[in-house]
């Protein structure tokens, strides 16, 4: 049977040969697993089976993707007479891809005899183990490199079967069974060598595509049995039709109309509905630096801006804690978002010994560097002698203020002897509630804030018995000259609430670097942004006038139509096959001759490096 | 993590008695999976003996009525009782567990002298 299109696809296990329940038990898991099943996604496990089970819901099994593993049975036969192609994604015992061990029973005559695997022809990665299963036969008769693609693939095969019937004439000595029907189907070990894979007959013109995995009825990758990579619609090939293509008339990669998915070894249209896209494979979670998010009705993953969001609950009213301390300080680990409050009490700072908390260690609260987003309110009321700013919550953008404290606070900061300035950076806005901020003796720059501009509604202060202002000016506590008159939160040019005149990264500058320095910028309203990494530094002038590879002034290596590039395309997949380009004596990139396939180094047939296709009598497609 | 540590190798005359242990941390070690294996120099490793989760035994041709398999679950212990010592058991013995992946010790010792 050739590759098909659709197939049963189900989860395979990780147990090993540690199972839970009875045989009967296990037979049930078997059957709910496997019924119908054609493509094991994971490892085939049977292990602790009866010997009355009747296994034949195995027999519809093409494929398994990791490996099978097959331990202290009883039944007689394993029929998984489909079986084309393990592949080992997964290994057992770190290189067994065939697993096979103690298939009997010590105290009757109940024992695996047959192991009919008589389509298995390919096992990707990984080798075989099968020992001591006292009356499995016709193990030694296999031809096992044949099958294994890795020659360096560890094989044991020994203590089985003793006493065996020969295998039947017509297998010559390969078998899996006493039986005509039983004979080994070789496909590698007896190619010509022109094959590097392989093969449906002896002939240097019989060899299987090199796509092929397990064999085939011809040399085409559609005359495949199974698939060494991907199956897309009966074709098997080495990637599944990517989501960029290089478009010739805007020298960029666009997305893709036709592009598929890898599930499995398949390429689909589109994922199962339990699964989400990551780049060009369906998955069934994102990665930990990915999110799902839906884009035009499609699920997929995306890389997070920094942190992945991660929201965790508070402290205070309705929360588990009364305060931070050292017994929950671990749990707001990588948050981003804190759905309640968060309270700073002395009980959870100096510890609680009626509670048997100890002290916090104060380098612990950096904890809160990844914080963004406080739904409910901020309360400090204590903090450690030697930190004399809340620069731990510079990255806090928002205090929602849905919960408040006492008498309507959502942010209240009082009696901090040791804090000489906030240090809230990132503070844009405090959706709710009254600012409470008072008795910090040493406490200055708060003056500065324009809370007005921080508050929905009109900002309802109480700020009071902190550092006077005139104390504050007399001492220099005052906002850096490059902050604008919004004010600031600290000292130096990265606590401003905004720029006099630039800003690069979050820190005031005088200028953007536009025409000297080691990195060149461009700048888009008020903000500095460095230009691309193709563009070359112009001496003197303008480098770059936008964020992208075609607003250089001039190129770093080549020029790909508008864009700089650092190299000219070279086998990048286009709307007809891989695309290959060189660059001229002008360092702009010019299409190679269409039957080139490996790249060139000019415009004609004779230019092609490695073997061109047969010349087709045709000029060059001017692109 | 799982952790498996051997010991009571050594050398024994001929005829003479081992008894191996194994001891277990980081599994569930009453329904685990376990086993003994062994490698002579210069040979291929073998399985000795194995005890399955539900307590099922089995032994290897060349030690079947000399070796002994045994488990203490209180102690998390595997145990290999080698009586009748020959020259040809000589070789370093391994511990696996088999929960989830398998997982080997690192083997103790056994010689067997003339």
């Known amino acids: 049977s050739e590759v098909g299109n659709s197939q049963a696809v189900c989860p395979g296990t990780l147990n090993g040969l540690s199972v839970t329940g009875d045989a009967e038990n296990q037979y049930q898991t078997l059957y709910k697993l496997y019924e119908r099943c054609e493509v094991v996604m994971g490892n085939l496990e049977i292990v602790l089976t009866g010997h009355n089970a009747d296994l034949s819901f195995l027999q519809w099994i093409r494929e398994v993707t990791g490996y099978v593993l097959v331990a202290m049975n009883e039944f007689s036969t394993l029929p998984l007479p489909n079986l084309r192609v393990v592949r080992g994604t997964q290994v057992y015992d770190g290189k067994f891809a065939i697993f096979v061990m103690l298939n009997y029973n010590t105290n009757s005559s109940h024992a695996l005899r047959q192991l009919r695997l008589t389509q298995l022809t390919e096992i990707l990665s990984g080798g075989v183990y099968i020992e001591k299963n006292d009356k499995l036969c016709h193990m030694d008769t296999i031809d096992w490199r044949d099958i294994v693609r890795d020659r360096d693939a560890e094989i044991v095969v020994k203590d089985n079967g003793r006493s065996c019937p020969p295998c039947h004439e017509v297998c010559k000595g390969r078998c899996w069974g006493p039986g005509s029907e039983d004979c080994q189907t070789l496909t590698k070990t007896i190619c010509a060598p022109q094959c590097n894979g392989r093969c449906f007959g002896r002939a240097p013109n019989e060899c299987c595509h090199e796509e092929c995995a397990g064999g085939c009825t011809g040399p085409l990758q559609t005359h495949c049995f199974a698939c060494r990579h991907f199956n897309d619609s009966g074709a098997c090939v080495p990637l599944c039709p990517q989501p960029l293509i290089y478009n010739k008339l805007t020298f960029q990669l666009e997305p893709n109309p036709d592009t598929k998915y890898q599930y499995g070894s398949v390429c689909v249209r589109s994922c199962p509905h339990n699964f989400v896209v990551d780049q060009s494979s369906c998955v069934r979670a994102c990665p930990s630096n990915k999110m799902e998010v839906e884009k035009n009705g499609l699920k997929m993953c995306e890389p997070c801006a920094g942190l992945c969001p991660k929201a965790c609950e508070g402290t205070g009213a309705g929360s588990h804690y009364q305060t931070v301390d050292s017994s929950n300080i671990d749990s707001f680990v990588n948050c981003t978002k804190i759905l309640g409050n968060l309270d700073f009490l002395i009980t959870g700072l100096e510890g609680d010994p009626w509670r048997n908390i100890s002290a916090l260690d104060p380098e612990k609260l950096n904890v809160f560097r990844t914080v963004r987003e406080i739904t409910g309110y901020l309360n400090i009321q204590s903090w450690p002698k030697h930190m004399h700013n809340f620069s731990v919550f510079s990255n806090l953008e928002t205090i929602g203020g849905r919960s408040l404290y006492n008498r309507g606070f959502s942010l209240l900061i009082m009696k901090n002897d040791n804090v000489t300035s906030l240090g809230l950076r990132s503070l844009r806005e405090v959706s709710a509630g009254r600012v409470y901020i008072t008795e910090n003796r040493r406490l200055c720059y708060l003056h500065t804030v324009q809370w007005a501009a921080l508050s929905r509604r009109r900002a309802d202060l109480d700020i009071r018995n902190n550092k006077p202002r005139g104390k504050c000016q007399q001492e220099g506590k005052v906002c850096d000259p490059l902050c604008s008159a919004d004010g600031c939160w600290g000292p130096g040019p990265a606590q401003c609430l905004s720029c006099r005149h630039y800003s690069r990264r979050g820190v005031c500058v005088e200028s953007c670097s536009f025409t000297q320095g080691e990195t060149r910028e461009f700048a888009e309203g008020t903000e500095c942004f460095e230009c691309h990494p193709e563009c070359e530094r112009v001496e003197g002038g303008i480098t770059c006038n936008g964020s992208g590879a075609d607003t250089c002034t001039r190129c770093a290596h080549y020029r790909d139509g508008p864009h700089c590039v650092e190299r000219c395309p070279e086998g990048i997949l286009g709307e007809r096959g891989p695309i290959y380009k060189y660059p001229d004596s002008s360092r702009e990139c010019r299409p190679c001759h269409e039957n080139c396939t490996r790249g060139c180094t000019g415009p004609l047939l004779q230019d092609c490096l490695g073997d061109a296709l047969p010349s087709a009598r045709r000029a060059p497609t001017v692109i | 993590e799982v952790q498996l540590v051997e010991s009571g190798g050594g050398l024994v005359q001929a005829g003479g008695s081992l008894r191996l242990s194994c001891a277990a941390s980081g599994l569930t070690f009453g329904s685990a999976p376990m086993g003994w294996y062994r490698q002579a120099p210069g040979k291929e490793r073998e399985l000795v003996a194995y005890i399955s989760g539900d307590e099922r035994i089995w032994y290897g041709d060349s030690v079947k009525g000399r070796f002994t398999i045994s488990r203490d679950t209180t102690k998390n212990t595997l145990y290999l009782q080698m009586n009748s010592l020959k020259p040809e058991d000589t070789a370093v013995y391994y511990c696996?567990?088999?929960?989830?992946?398998?997982?080997w010790g690192q083997g103790t010792q056994v010689t067997v002298s003339s």
């Open positions: 696996v567990s088999d929960v989830k992946v398998r997982h």
